[in-house]
């Protein structure tokens, strides 16, 4: 058993039929010695008396809020949560496996630049009685500070009969050095509590590997005289690291016909303009990627040819 926060404890259980469970001793936080009784949750049934209560925790029915009283007055509470281990593996019932980029991916994180700021998100089908707490650091043995905000519900989607909820959190490395080579990864730890079930999820990454620039901005077309060609121009996104001479992007320019089946013409360039042929009813899209490190491409910025 260990303390998650004040008056909240996590009991780690091997979860299999007829498992013996864990013996837990609760102590009432009071100078009183006599006349103390214990109850669980809303029930008025007295479970025991005395300053300590010894219980055998085997299942969710044994978890919950234990309260010690004296003469009708509440003295203290202890909330017991369960962390299940099945076949040697901690349960992952609360979050959905996003399966991207690989199986057992519960947390996904992205950064728009090298400032040390990043966003992580996760999915669940659970809508109520759910809380998340996020901690992060750079390195684990001698951790350097990363500050994370509160996790918030960021999207709700319908998937067949069920809804799916996306939560996200923003974190900022306290002493980020954008130009430095990373040697220790960022560690992100999410504590999830649904009713009386505790689970924890972790992700470890280098900022350079989760970079995904915003799409190029100010995408414009300039027709070239006496030609079907146009000059496409764009700018670096505002959120990208500066100076651009050091934090450089490369770009992919695509001409796409109205039909998805039509052949796509693609041009790769390090410049912020390109000359392409603009077909009728086509659109021109541009996306960006770090020039010197193959992390994710940005989403497309698009304009119609007409």
């Amino acid at each position: 058993i260990w303390e998650l926060k004040k008056d909240v404890y996590v009991v780690e259980l091997d979860w299999y039929p007829d498992a013996p469970g864990e013996m837990v001793v609760l102590t009432c936080d009071t100078p009183e010695e006599d006349g103390i009784t214990w109850t669980l949750d809303q029930s008025s049934e007295v479970l025991g008396s005395g300053k300590t209560l010894t219980i055998q925790v085997k299942e969710f029915g044994d978890a919950g809020q234990y309260t010690c009283h004296k003469g009708g007055e509440v003295l203290s509470h202890s909330l017991l949560l369960l962390h299940k281990k099945e076949d040697g593996i901690w349960s992952t019932d609360i979050l959905k496996d996003q399966k991207e980029p690989k199986n057992k991916t519960f947390l996904r994180c992205e950064a728009k630049n090298y400032s040390g700021r990043f966003t992580c998100w996760w999915l669940t089908t659970i809508s109520t009685d759910l809380t998340f707490s996020v901690k992060s650091s750079r390195g684990s043995s001698d951790p350097q500070g990363v500050t994370c905000g509160a996790a918030t519900l960021s999207a709700e989607r319908v998937r067949g009969d069920n809804k799916e909820y996306e939560y996200s959190v923003e974190c900022q490395e306290d002493s980020a050095c954008p130009a430095a080579e990373e040697s220790l990864p960022i560690e992100v730890m999410v504590d999830a509590v649904h009713k009386l079930k505790y689970e924890n999820y972790t992700s470890s990454f280098f900022i350079r590997d989760i970079i995904k620039p915003d799409p190029p901005k100010n995408l414009q077309l300039k027709p070239l005289k006496n030609s079907r060609q146009v000059e496409v121009s764009w700018e670096y996104p505002d959120t990208w690291s500066t100076p651009h001479s050091y934090f450089s992007l490369t770009f992919c320019v695509q001409v796409q016909g109205k039909s998805k089946r039509e052949k796509k013409d693609r041009v790769f360039t390090d410049k912020t303009s390109a000359t392409v042929i603009c077909r009728k009813n086509a659109s021109i899209s541009v996306r960006a990627q770090d020039r010197y490190y193959s992390s994710s491409w940005s989403e497309w910025a698009s304009v119609p040819c007409s």
Epitope: E59, D93, I126, K197
Partner: antibody, heavy 116, light 108 residues
């Protein structure tokens, strides 16, 4: 205690609001549920409204019902009833432990008949 | 999400024992309640958290199970136990909520 009212005979498509009036406890501390039971059939949950006022609905509801509350009442609005909505409608109070809860105080129910 | 109750009806003698099963289509941990309903009356809570007896309910009623399989057992049957019994999952309003189809208990 909990008591439903507003059940009556209505024609299909006529909006109807059922009201659940509570006494002896505060709605700001408990989840409330609306459940219906067609004649001779089982219990079917429609939706719940949390202590904080958030409403959650069964997947089949699709906007046909809306739950809201004041300090002492919980309303169930039937936007466009059909004959299939003929049932006794129950309101019940949760235990106070969770938003998705079990229910230990029930009203006697109010009968809604939808017929042309 | 579905809760399947079996059997749909059962007949037993006074003093006998009845077992009703409730199966969830996904794990709901121990978030299951049992209700008793008599004709013309609202449901009455018997058991919550799969096995905890509600206030004032006789100990002849007992519940067990976790995950997807749950059981309500009524022992030393009395005539007053003739009713329809429902299980209810309260795991989550979106990911596991609702009532079983009911089991009618006839006491002879």
């Amino acid at each position: 205690s909990v008591e439903e009212s507003g059940g009556r005979l209505v024609t299909p498509g006529t909006p109807l609001t059922l009201t659940c009036t509570v006494s002896g406890f505060s709605l700001s501390s408990y989840t409330m549920i609306w459940v219906r039971q067609a004649p001779g059939e089982g219990l079917e949950w429609i939706g719940i409204i949390s202590a904080g006022g958030s409403a959650y609905y069964a997947s089949w509801v699709n906007g046909r019902f809306t739950i809201s509350k004041t300090s002492t009442t919980v309303d169930l609005k039937m936007t466009s009833p059909t004959t299939g909505d003929t049932a006794t409608y129950f309101c019940a109070r949760g235990s106070g432990t969770y938003t998705s809860d079990y229910f230990n105080i029930w009203g006697p129910g109010t009968l809604v008949t939808v017929s042309s | 999400f579905e809760l399947t109750q079996t059997p749909s009806s059962v007949e037993a003698a006074v003093g006998g024992t009845v077992t009703i099963k409730c199966q969830a289509s996904q794990s709901i941990d121990s978030w299951l309640a049992w209700y008793q309903q008599k004709p013309g009356q609202p449901p009455k809570l018997l058991i919550y958290s799969a096995s905890k007896l509600a206030t004032g309910v006789p100990s002849r009623f007992s519940g067990s199970g976790s995950g997807t399989q749950f059981t309500l057992t009524i022992s030393d049957l009395e005539c007053a136990d003739a009713a329809t019994y429902y299980c209810q999952s309260y795991y989550d309003a979106n990911a596991g909520y609702g009532f079983g189809g009911g089991t009618k208990v006839v006491v002879v």
